[in-house]
């Protein structure tokens, strides 16, 4: 088992909004849960965009999930990752 490296980034979207992207990379096996939580509960699936789980060329995998949020409400969002029985949460950077 190779645990993922998780990285959260933010980019400007429309006025007053930002897109936050959570990337998991260099993990094996390929089964992974990667999702955004808002206010501690599941963020509706139709407000999230997922990338495919793809090989990254080193025998491991990578994927991502993104969502658009209001600027100033970053604290309410966390990226949740679960892989091979381990889990972690990752805040949006300031």
């Amino acid at each position: 088992t190779v645990p993922p490296m998780v990285n959260v980034t933010r980019s400007e979207a429309s006025e007053g909004n930002i897109t936050v992207t959570c990337r998991a990379s260099s993990f094996y096996p390929r089964n992974i849960i990667l999702t955004w939580r808002q206010d501690g509960v599941s963020l509706a699936h139709d407000t999230q965009q997922w990338g495919d789980v793809l090989p990254d060329g080193n025998g491991t995998y990578q994927t991502w999930v993104a969502t658009r949020i209001c600027r100033g409400e970053e604290q309410r969002f966390t990226c949740y990752m679960e892989h091979s029985g381990n889990h972690s949460t990752h805040p949006v950077p300031s």
């Epitope: 808002q38 409400e73 309410r76 679960e82």
Partner: antibody, heavy 119, light 107 residues
């Protein structure tokens, strides 16, 4: 460590308002987290009532939405529960608690305060 | 709303026994589940979060499992301090709801 302490009257008359205070020590309620009220009825059923978060946003249980208000006093690091038009069905032990945004589970609770609704 | 159904409502067991408590959700909660222990006259205490993760300080005789709509809490080699009531709680969506509880009593 975050510590929470509930306070308020132990007896309320039917049709009146129930008002409780949660005093938080060890953490600023404006820094982070969702600050919640949960109640436990005499037969032990637990009900999540609602929260006010670090920025003052509230979220209530729809079953209580027309009767509940959660507010705060940031200068005293307190948050409050008001429940209007109470009936004997609102007799319960009321707890305050909080959760972090990594998941809406409750790591610590206050000791609880029993409120009896009776004429 | 998602309803949480716990079973059994109560059970009697002896010190050293293994007991299992189950919790069924009315919809898929995708492991968004917590377990609490409550002793008489005390506040609930967090045991498990994210369906399987033991909270800080919880003894390793406790374990939890499940997925989808079915979850369980297992206590191996029951100790005197384990007697009390146990509740599950989902956090998949609002409103957050709890199971009705399982009372674990001394046989």
């Amino acid at each position: 460590d975050v510590q929470l302490q509930e306070s308020g009257p132990g007896l309320v008359k039917p049709s009146q308002s129930l008002s409780l205070t949660c005093t938080v020590t060890g953490y600023s309620i404006t820094s982070d987290y969702a600050w919640n009220w949960i109640r436990q009825f005499p037969r032990n059923k637990l009900e999540w009532m609602g929260y006010i978060n670090y920025s003052g946003t509230t979220n209530y249980n729809p079953s209580l939405k027309s009767r509940i208000s959660i507010t705060r006093d940031t200068s005293k690091n307190q948050f409050f529960l008001q429940l209007i038009s109470v009936t004997t069905e609102d007799t319960a032990t009321y707890y305050c608690s909080y959760y972090r945004y990594d998941g809406a589970w409750f790591p610590y609770w206050g000791q609880g305060t029993l409120v009896t609704v009776s004429a | 709303d998602i309803q949480m159904t716990q079973s059994p409502a109560s059970l009697s067991a002896s010190v050293g026994e293994t007991v299992t408590i189950t919790c069924r959700a009315s919809g898929n909660i995708h492991n968004y589940l917590a377990w609490y222990q409550q002793k008489q006259g005390k506040s609930p205490q967090l045991l498990v979060y994210n369906a399987i993760m033991l909270a800080d300080g919880v003894p390793s005789r406790f374990s939890a499992s499940g997925s989808g709509t079915q979850y369980s809490l297992k206590i191996n080699s029951l100790q005197p301090e384990d007697f009390g009531s146990y509740y599950c709680q989902h956090f998949w969506s609002f409103p957050l709801t709890f199971g009705a509880g399982t009372k674990v009593e001394i046989k």
